[in-house]
């Protein structure tokens, strides 16, 4: 357990032991003196820490960040694999602990947990076969990716696998299910009348989180899932394959977990830290594990499986990728090959394994009990050239810069916590277990969480997802930073970002997206209601339609990939460091928290309009079951008015009054918390935010008013419409109550 505060106040302890009544006058006089002294000290230290030259401090922090250091750190972090649960990743944790101490943090601790992880069997490799009528294997998929030049002799490169796949050797006919999205299975089952029961399905990666694909396949009755990377999604036209470019070669494969944890953390200890005394569920009761074997392959191997497909033709061009195959849906192979089947051979094992987070503390000078957290993961599938080490290198440089300021006598107003999370790739386990262990502190003291996974997924423009509370912070900060983009020399980051990624609603402003999940902010935002944000450099979504970046989670995600093709000068990494670091600096150092509650009011109205319009696709049912959104719109209106009044008070109040200041800041800090429903969303108890949740159909995407959205989803197919519309009404009432209750937290206290 990390310990920030020494909460032994001798003055308070003495005050609890009054000796004689006649000393009352002395105590009273002393009390006034003490109060005056503390008041004076509070203002003095506040001004010393943050007010004398706030711009200078921020400038000093930003100027200290160096691209060359980020490059050096990235190289250091990517020479060998750092798979969660391995000795190599433990050694890296100790190295980071040591360096953060050297950089000047007050304390740096390792926190360990024993969580369920998953690995291939070293002596019994996973593969997929085409078998003939005699059961002979006439084709086998590859056992590993061809290693990139210079890395041939690196040991412990984990072969491609789907983490947490159960063992099994299913065989049967193949069905091609496109991206295996909810709508793809609707198309197959409802329109094409194709039954996946007892079949092995093959799905292309992309569009949605792989865990959702597997869940959908399971629900459709499949006995196994093959995931593959289609060149249509992972090979950008006009770019060479690695090592000559940043495209995916045919032997490249995307690893990844296939869990459906819904925010639970370690599958064996949902809700509680996986420590030494934790009660662990049996594997049969574990949260989110898939029930059918799953395995990923590259497009050379996929070609061999798909080229023989028969059965139904693909429904339309949206089902066809870029391989020279017919993209027939199946089931099974065409005429000449109809007696051949597909067989999976999956032998992976799940085991409880120790993981290590690194938690660094820079104590706040004025409000040490208010925490601003910067966290990103350290574990990688292989070398982690982009994911996560491009982010970890940036965090390292941010820590170094803060440490440099601290060594010169500066301290932030609030405490900053830095985290290097373990086992993110296995289901956000390190961050979730730590947050579970420290939930009582975090819900009382957590100001903000800034995520720091991959710094780049492209080199076109900035991408930001965050709570609406942070919109103004991000806009103001990016107006102060220089754009790294070609053609925008001397212009602000805000300007290039706005030009390249304009807001769909407001002209002259850039796009900021909703937080979904699939990264370590999840527990902080979706479970605990701590204001959160993330920023990275991204691709041009207009021209590059591929999902993620082509080499995501493959062996080819190396230092050279970044240094040769994405960011040779590390200028985009530096910009991301400035954005992430600048946000942390402002959140930790601003006298008044840089949150604008009026921006929440704006989005709440937008989200209410959106969900109302979805519901209005069923006007007859709304009438029949007396479904009304009036209460929700009324609550949003109240929120808007109260937020507006709060903002006026915030502008005008006496900022030299420490009690008032703390009171106003607490209202801002606790606003995000007010959107938490302690009961959670239906069937998803760890997704507790009423305004945002990861989409039930794609963990990566955020959904607004998720309770209402899910109640309305596919409602026309529900067997009991009365019950279904009753649930819609229940969800509207929960949303209404929550918005109204949150609004009231912003009302004048007395």
């Amino acid at each position: 357990m990390w310990n920030l505060l020494h909460e032994t106040d001798s003055a308070v302890a003495t005050a609890r032991r009054p000796r004689w009544l006649c000393a009352g006058a002395l105590v009273l006089a002393g009390g006034f003196f003490l109060l005056g002294f503390l008041f004076g000290w509070f203002i003095k230290s506040s001004s010393e820490a943050t007010n004398i030259t706030p711009k200078h401090n921020m400038k000093a922090f930003l100027d200290e960040l160096k691209a060359e250091n980020i490059k050096k750190f990235l190289h250091n972090f990517t020479q060998i694999p750092h798979l969660a649960g391995t000795e190599q990743n433990f050694q890296l944790a100790k190295q980071i602990q040591s360096q953060w101490k050297e950089f000047g943090l007050d304390s740096v601790e390792l926190t360990h947990y024993d969580v369920l992880l998953s690995y291939p069997n070293k002596t019994h490799p996973n593969y997929i076969s085409i078998i003939n009528e005699d059961g002979n294997e006439i084709f086998n998929t590859s056992l590993f990716e061809p290693p990139p030049a210079g890395y041939e002799n690196v040991s412990d490169i984990v072969p491609p696998f789907s983490a947490f796949s159960p063992q099994g050797m299913p065989e049967g006919d193949l069905v091609y299910v496109n991206y295996a999205r909810t709508e793809d299975f609707f198309k197959l089952e409802r329109d094409m009348k194709i039954n996946c029961s007892g079949k092995i399905v093959i799905a292309r990666y992309g569009k949605v989180f792989r865990g959702n694909k597997v869940k959908n396949a399971q629900l459709a009755g499949a006995t196994g899932v093959i995931l593959y990377s289609d060149p249509a999604d992972y090979f950008a036209p006009g770019v060479k394959s690695y090592p000559d470019g940043w495209n995916l070669p045919g032997g490249g494969v995307q690893r990844g977990n296939i869990l459906n944890l819904n925010g639970a953390g370690d599958p064996l200890t949902p809700g509680y830290p996986a420590n030494e005394y934790a009660y662990r569920r049996g594997i049969a009761e574990a949260v989110g594990l898939p029930s059918i074997p799953v395995h990923p392959i590259g497009y050379y191997d996929a070609q061999k499986l798909l080229e023989k497909m028969g059965g139904s033709a693909s429904p339309d061009s949206s089902w066809r990728g870029s391989l020279k195959v017919p993209y027939n849906v199946g089931p099974g192979f065409t005429g000449n090959f109809s007696t051949q089947k597909v067989k999976m051979h999956i032998h992976s094992t799940s085991e409880v394994t120790r993981i290590y987070n690194v938690i660094g503390t820079l104590r706040g000078a004025v409000e040490p009990d208010r925490y601003v957290i910067l966290g990103g993961h350290r574990d990688s599938w292989v070398f982690g050239g982009i994911d996560p080490q491009s982010g970890a290198a940036v965090v390292h440089e941010i820590v170094r810069s803060f440490g440099t300021l601290k060594k010169e006598g500066w301290r932030p107003r609030r405490t900053i916590l830095f985290a290097s999370w373990d086992a993110e790739e296995f289901g956000l386990l390190g961050s979730t277990e730590w947050a579970e262990e420290n939930s009582r502190l975090l819900q009382e003291r957590g100001v903000a969480y800034i995520n720091a996974d991959s710094s780049i997924e492209g080199n076109y423009t900035l991408r930001v997802d965050c709570t609406p509370l942070m919109y103004s912070l991000v806009y103001n900060l990016t107006k102060e930073l220089e754009s790294p983009d070609e053609g925008f020399e001397g212009k602000s980051l805000y300007e290039s970002w706005t030009k390249k990624s304009p807001s769909p609603e407001f002209s002259g402003m850039p796009r900021i997206s909703k937080l979904g999940s699939g990264n370590d902010f999840e527990v902080f935002f979706q479970r605990l209601g701590i204001a959160s944000g993330r920023a990275r450099y991204t691709k041009n979504w207009e021209t590059n339609k591929f999902s993620s970046y082509p080499l995501y989670h493959s062996v080819y995600e190396t230092y050279e990939l970044v240094e040769k093709f994405y960011d040779p000068m590390f200028k985009y990494h530096l910009t991301v460091a400035q954005v992430r670091g600048g946000m942390v600096f402002e959140l930790a150092n601003s006298v008044v928290l840089p949150f604008d509650c009026r921006d929440y009011a704006v989005v709440l109205r937008k989200y209410a309009d959106k969900i109302y319009n979805i519901s209005m696709k069923h006007p007859q049912e709304m009438k029949t079951y007396s479904v009304s959104f009036d209460s929700l719109f009324s609550a949003v209106k109240n929120f808007t008015e109260i937020a507006s009044k709060f903002s006026e008070r915030l502008r005008d109040f006496d900022k030299s009054n420490p009690i008032l200041l703390r009171m106003m800041n607490d209202q801002l800090m606790f606003l995000e918390r007010a959107f938490i429903d302690p009961l959670g969303l239906p069937d998803r108890p760890f997704y507790r935010h009423v305004i945002y949740a990861p989409s039930s159909h794609n963990k990566y995407a955020g959904e607004s008013f998720p309770g209402i959205y899910d109640a309305l989803f596919d409602i026309e197919s529900k067997v009991d419409p009365s019950q279904a519309w009753g649930e819609v009404k229940r969800q509207i009432s929960i949303a209404t109550f929550t918005v109204q209750a949150a609004a009231e937290t912003l009302s004048e206290v007395a």
Epitope: N140, S142, P146
Partner: nanobody, 127 residues
Amino acid sequence: EVQLVESGGGVVQPGRSLRLSCAASGFSFSGYGQHWVRQAPGKGLEWVAYISYDASNKYYADNVKGRFTISRDNSKNTLYLQMNSLRAEDTAVYYCAKDPAWGLRLGESSSYDFDIWGQGTMVTVSS
């Protein structure tokens, strides 16, 4: 320097066994499929066997199927050909050859073009 060096050839009686080795250097051996090819005296080249970069797939010419086994040890950058039940018609110079396509399976291909060859090792099957 990029090279392949075969060894293990010699004179052997029909029905006996021989194991050929091919040591690779100067390129990323574990990323490429490898072939064995042979040339009988006074004849043209004949493809014998192919192994994919990761040994997951192996293909053989019909006249050696069941008798010859191709294998590789990527940690030693070495390709092998285990030849059992040798016949007089197996007499030839045996060459190992690198497949030109990195990571690609060309085992089923009807024609092979090789970008790196060894110098060959002579196998004579005679009573």
